[in-house]
C-alpha cells in the first residue's frame, strides 16, 4: 500500500451513541476518544448525511454485552481494548475524493464501513471505531 | 484498490485479535453484497499502549 497522504476521519462511531466531530483531510488523526459513559440514548450514526424525511429518528440500540476469558490487546485504564484493522477494497478505485472528507464519495464509503462494523460486532463488547483512513492500494 | 485503515474499540476482555479477524472475515461476502465492497487482505493487530493516532503509521500490511 502506498504511504501517500489520504483522507482520515476522527469521529468515534459506536453503539448507542455517536460523537460528531469535524473531519479534516490531514494525514495526522485526532486521538481516539471514548465517551465517559455508554449511554442508551438513541442518536444518529456519526457523519450521517443520507436523504431522510425531516421527522426521521435514526438510532442503533445498545446490544447485550458478552464477556469471555479471551486474552486481549493492551488496555487503557478505561477498560477498553483497541485493535488496528486494515483491508483492501478491490472493486473501488482510489481517487482524490477519498482525500477529502467533505465529498459524497468519502462520506458514503465511511458511512458504509461504519455501519458494517457496527453490525458485524454488535453481539460483543464493541464500543466503536475511529480514525478511518483511506489510502491508495 | 482502496486500502482502509481504522481502529476498533471493545470492552476489555470481550474479544481478542484472532476473533476480531475471524468475525470480520466471516462477513466479507455479505459486505460485498450489501455494500458493494469486495474485501481482501484483512489484517488485524493490537494497538500498542499508550494509544496514539501516530501508532497507525507504524503498520503497513
Amino acid at each position: 500500500a502506498s504511504g501517500s497522504a489520504s483522507g482520515s476521519a476522527s469521529t468515534l462511531v459506536h453503539n448507542g451513541t455517536s460523537a460528531r466531530a469535524t473531519t479534516t483531510p490531514a494525514s495526522k488523526s485526532t486521538p481516539f476518544s471514548i465517551p465517559s459513559h455508554h449511554s442508551d440514548t438513541p442518536t444518529t450514526l456519526a457523519s450521517h448525511s443520507t436523504k431522510t424525511d425531516a421527522s426521521s429518528t435514526h438510532h442503533s440500540s445498545v446490544p447485550p454485552l458478552t464477556s469471555s476469558n479471551h486474552s486481549t490487546s493492551p488496555q487503557l485504564s478505561t477498560g477498553v481494548s483497541f485493535f488496528f484493522l486494515s483491508f483492501h477494497i478491490s472493486n473501488l478505485q482510489f481517487n482524490s475524493s477519498l482525500e477529502d472528507p467533505s465529498t459524497d464519495y468519502y462520506q458514503e464509503l465511511q458511512r458504509d464501513i461504519s455501519e458494517m462494523f457496527l453490525q458485524i460486532y454488535k453481539q460483543g463488547g464493541f464500543l466503536g471505531l475511529s480514525n478511518i483512513k483511506f489510502r491508495p492500494g | 484498490s482502496v486500502v482502509v485503515q481504522l481502529t476498533l474499540a471493545f470492552r476489555e476482555g470481550t474479544i481478542n485479535v484472532h476473533d476480531v479477524e475471524t468475525q470480520f472475515n466471516q462477513y466479507k461476502t455479505e459486505a460485498a453484497s450489501r455494500y458493494n465492497l469486495t474485501i481482501s487482505d484483512v489484517s488485524v493487530s493490537d494497538v500498542p499502549f499508550p494509544f496514539s493516532a501516530q501508532s497507525h503509521h507504524h503498520h503497513h500490511h
Epitope: 444518529t44 436523504k51 435514526h58 455501519e115 454488535k122 | 466471516q26 453484497s33 450489501r34 458493494n36
Partner: antibody, heavy 122, light 106 residues
Amino acid sequence: EVQLVQSGAEVKKPGASVKVSCKASGYTFTDNYINWVRQAPGQRLEYIGWIYPGSGNNKFNEKFKGRVTLTVDTSARTAYMELSSLRSEDTAVYYCARDYPFPSYHYGMDYWGQGTTVTVSS
Amino acid sequence: DIQLTQSPSSLSASVGDRVTITCSASSSVSYIHWFQQKPGKAPKLWIYSTSNLASGVPSRFSGSGSGTDFTLTVSSLQPEDFATYYCQQRSSYPPTFGGGTKVEIK
C-alpha cells in the same frame, strides 16, 4: 404479526415522479433493512435498492441511480421509494421487503408488502 | 451483475410428481434464496441460504447446490404448489433474480 402495507396503485405520465410508501408493523422498524424490488408485467423481479431505517443509510442498483430516492420516517414506521423521470418501461408492480443486518443477512427477504402497481402512460 | 438462469422456464406436472427446478449462476455465489409467487400476489421467501426452509414451508420442499448450480426439489407435488419459483443471489451487488420457473398443472 409482521406486516408491510404499501400505498395504492398510481397512474403517472412520462416524465413525472411517483412516491410509494411502505408501512411496517409487528417488529422493531429500525432493526431491519427495507428493500425495494419491482416486477414489470411478465418479467423477472428486479432489485432497486435498500435503506436501513436504523441509520437512513441506503444503496441503489446502479441502473436506478439518479432517479430513485429512498427515505424513511421512523416515527411513522414508514419507508418511501420515489422514482423520478418516469418512462413507460417503469410500469411495474413495486414491492418493499424487509431483511436482516449482519449476522443474520443470510435469512433473506422474509416479509413483503402486497405490492403497488405503477402505470406510466401518456 | 451476476446472471441467474432458471430451467425449465415452465413445466407441467401432476399432483404427486417429483419436480426439480435448477438455477445456474454466471459466476460462483455463496448461496441462493428461492421465492414462490402466485398470480397477483407478492413473492414469498420459500428457501433461504440454499437449503433452509422458510417458516411454514412444507418439508416436501428441499434445496441444494453450491458454486454456480442450485436446485429446488418438490418430492411430491401438491395442488397448492402450483406457482412460479424464482431464485435470487445476494453474493454480489446488486442482488439479482432468476427468470422464474412456472409450475403448471398437467
